[in-house]
């Protein structure tokens, strides 16, 4: 027989199955042009010796062979005895050390038989009603296939599943999707309705993120508020990775987890735009402000759980570098100013109601006056800070007022509103005799003192009916009591309090009159 | 007022170094990142590499086309940026710009710097 | 690598015109896009970011809208000023990406 010829003799070797587990296996034959053909199959097992013969029957049951030696691929032409019109079938019988294997047989058209590509180029995942869906572009002259996918996860090994039959320019196939971890999946494609026809080779992997994305495990931490009134937002942990099937390892397209940085500054709600998402890699800089963050993860399918934390507001307040004055046509507020063109909002809130909304304004951009100082007057009329509380004010500042990360704290202080000297005047001043020649003169805390920072100090004054003369003693605001000496006995005095603040004078008190009554000696 | 000024730039031959600085005023220089960017005659605009600021680790990357040939890095005390090109070839020839790293901040480039690699 | 393509990469438009300029992302990038205007022989200047942001200072006849995938930018009445080339950049991810610019010029 001639080499290119399909031999219709008995093989040179006894034809019997040894049934082994090693062997020929995986036979597929196709059409390779107009009039060539080519069979591939594997061998498994040691190849030493071995010898392969590639076996074929006809229809009308003559059967003939091909010599291949070592060789497991043989390309042949129309010419070489096989029908390829007709259905033949076809196994290949390897022959070693005196014992014969044979691979399943394959039974097909030859001419029919076109080698099948896998999907190939892009091919497009979206989810519909809880399943995968896989989309691609039939290859070129190949409409009409059978079509198979397999999948696996990180722990998982390979299952196969069916797409069904297709028959379109564009493909589709419908798959398990996992709910919390990620899946490789591959795809094949061979000849609708011939059943011996050959699967093409697996698709490369397509890799696919689980329904949910990963809940973001991270921490966060802030720093202390640096002399710029802006404190860093760092990351204390990173988001856990994704587990990977063996074929998404690397640069796998697909399963991606991107997480993004949602900031809400709660702080001054009158500002142009109180949210900002960012890229998680870019951690900002933040104001004194309350701020809610929120790590959003999401994937190829949308956005999964996030995780939300309370940055809660930078508490330190500044030793008055505000200057409040009031006057006739109303207040006005004083403080060192930032660059040129910024704006400022002001937040005012009664001390003990931190749970309601603050009040706030905005200023139009602005540029320092003349002393350096910018300024936020309102009217009287405007009730603004008017009622005799402790109100907490902060100043946040902004040369880009949209961009929430530029936004710094200018100075955050207390300030008690209304009219400020009288409310503040101390009450209940009493006077007890101390020695032969001194008194301790007792008042109740001012209500100034309920607002931090803002008592600067107590005036005692002692004014002596006889001679007029008066004498004022400074008091720590965080004292209500102090011992009057050098007194005479059998004057008559008046005493009088008044707590003062940073920017204004309080009102005395009501005068309380007394005097150390003369030691007769016996 | 913020300003990025680059210098450093002028004629190279193909195989040859060279450096581009980048001195920047008004602004935090040390918390910013920094990028360069290039921009071919006639062409469109193309990232070239990264730094981020020395609190976020300082570390730096690069566009495939100049990887393993470029180096940035960064003088926080001098407010300067550098971009050391080395095995310099014809298409690196571009106008460099330095600018602060987009959509975090603000968003500041210079005004540009020429280098022609030619034989 | 993320590809922007952006169209058209020229237009010619009259005084008082909308123009309109669409960036498309090879993947979502949520809305971490920026426009940049750049005059000849000048360095790029911000217009948008965040998507749809105006930047401080720049004039509200510029204007940006969209977010994954799909971005457009309009000026809603072209000045005789806004001659220029017109970038779109995403920052989602390294490598940073341009579109290859829209060169506006007036009729």
């Known amino acids: 027989c001639r080499t290119s010829e399909c031999c219709f003799q008995d093989p040179p070797y006894s034809d019997a199955d040894s049934g082994s587990a090693s062997g020929p296996r995986d036979l597929s034959c196709y059409r390779i042009s107009s009039a060539g053909y080519e069979c591939s199959w594997q061998y498994e097992g040691p190849t030493a010796g071995v010898s392969h013969f590639l076996r074929c029957c006809l229809s009308s049951g003559r059967c003939c062979y091909f010599a291949t030696g070592s060789a497991t691929r043989l390309q042949f032409s129309d010419q070489a005895g096989v029908s390829v019109l007709h259905t033949v079938t076809l196994w290949v019988e390897s022959w070693a050390r005196n014992r014969t294997e044979k691979s399943p047989e394959v039974t097909l058209q030859l001419y029919k038989s076109v080698k099948y590509k896998p999907p190939l180029g892009d091919i497009k995942v979206s989810k519909l009603a809880g399943q995968l869906r896989m989309e691609w572009e039939t290859p070129d002259n190949q409409v009409g296939a059978e079509v198979q996918f397999r999948h696996r996860t990180p722990s998982s090994s390979w299952k196969l599943g069916d797409c069904g039959p297709q028959d379109d320019d564009t493909e589709s196939c419908l798959c398990p999707l996992e709910m919390n971890v990620a899946q490789e999946f591959q795809l094949r494609r061979r000849r609708l309705g011939s059943q011996g026809s050959s699967w093409s080779k697996w698709s490369s992997p397509v890799c696919v993120p689980p329904e949910n994305p990963p809940q973001p495990q991270v921490r966060f931490s802030v720093e202390q508020l640096g002399r710029d009134g802006r404190r860093r937002l760092t990351l204390k942990e990173q988001p856990t990775q994704l587990e990977l099937p063996e074929g998404c390892q690397g640069p796998a397209p697909g399963v991606e987890v991107t997480y993004q940085l949602q900031l809400h500054m709660l702080s001054c709600p009158c500002k142009a735009k109180a949210t900002r998402t960012l890229p998680l890699e870019k951690m900002p800089y933040l104001s004194g402000a309350a701020y809610n963050v929120a790590v959003i993860s999401s994937n190829r399918f949308g956005p999964g759980p996030n995780q939300t934390w309370h940055i809660p507001a930078d508490t330190h307040t500044e030793p008055v570098a505000l200057n409040i004055s009031v006057g006739t046509n109303g207040t006005t507020m004083y403080w060192p100013a930032r660059a040129q063109s910024t704006t400022y909002c002001i937040e005012w809130q009664p001390v003990g109601q931190e749970g309601s909304l603050a009040t706030c304004n905005l200023t139009a951009p602005q540029d320092p006056d003349p002393a350096g100082m910018a300024t936020y007057s309102w009217s009287r009329e405007s009730g603004a800070m008017g009622q005799e509380k402790c109100y907490h004010i902060t100043i946040f500042a902004s040369a880009h007022p949209k961009k929430l990360t530029l936004w710094s704290t200018v100075l955050s202080t207390y300030h008690f509103g209304g009219n400020a000297s009288a409310a503040g005047t101390p009450h209940h001043v009493s006077v007890k005799n101390h020695s032969l020649d001194s008194v301790s003169v007792d008042w109740a805390p001012s209500l100034l003192s309920t607002c931090p920072g803002v008592l600067k100090e107590y005036v005692v004054r002692c004014r002596d009916e006889d001679s007029n003369q008066v004498s004022e003693h400074p008091v720590q605001p965080t004292e209500t009591q102090v011992t009057l000496s050098d007194l005479r006995a059998g004057v008559a005095y008046t005493v009088q309090v008044r707590a003062d603040t940073a920017w204004l004078r309080g009102a005395w008190s009501q005068p309380q009159r007394f005097s150390i009554k003369v030691q007769v000696s016996d | 007022e913020v300003q990025l000024v680059e210098s450093g730039g002028g004629l190279v031959k193909p195989g040859g170094s060279l450096r581009l600085s980048c001195a920047a005023s008004?602004?935090?220089?040390?918390?910013?990142?920094m990028n360069w960017v290039r921009q071919a005659p006639g062409k469109g605009l193309e990232w070239v590499g990264r730094?981020?600021?020395?609190?976020?680790?300082?570390?730096?990357d690069y566009a495939a086309p100049v990887k393993g040939r470029f180096t940035v890095s960064r003088d926080d005390p001098k407010n300067t940026l550098y971009l050391q090109m080395n095995s310099l070839k014809t298409e690196d020839t571009a106008v460099y710009y330095c600018?602060?790293?987009?959509?975090?901040?603000?968003?500041?480039w210079g005004q540009g710097i020429l280098v022609t690699v030619s034989s | 690598d993320i590809q922007m393509t952006q169209s058209p990469s020229s237009l010619s438009a009259s005084v008082g015109d909308r123009v309109t300029i669409t960036c498309q992302a090879s993947?979502?990038?949520?809305?971490?896009l920026n426009w940049y205007q750049q005059k000849p022989g000048k360095a790029p200047n911000l217009l948008i970011y965040?998507?749809?942001d105006l930047e401080t200072g720049v004039p509200s006849r510029f204007s940006g809208s969209g977010s994954g995938t799909d971005f457009t930018f309009t000026i809603s009445s072209l000045q005789p000023e806004d001659i220029a080339t017109y970038y779109c950049?995403?920052?989602?991810?390294?490598?940073?990406?341009f579109g290859g610019g829209t060169k506006v010029e007036i009729k």
């Open positions: 600018t602060t790293d987009p959509g975090w901040e603000f968003d500041y």
């Open positions: 008004g602004f935090t220089f040390s918390n910013a990142w």
């Open positions: 730094i981020k600021s020395k609190t976020d680790g300082g570390t730096t």
């Open positions: 993947q979502d990038i949520s809305n971490f």
């Open positions: 965040d998507a749809s």
């Open positions: 950049q995403q920052y989602d991810n390294l490598p940073l990406t």
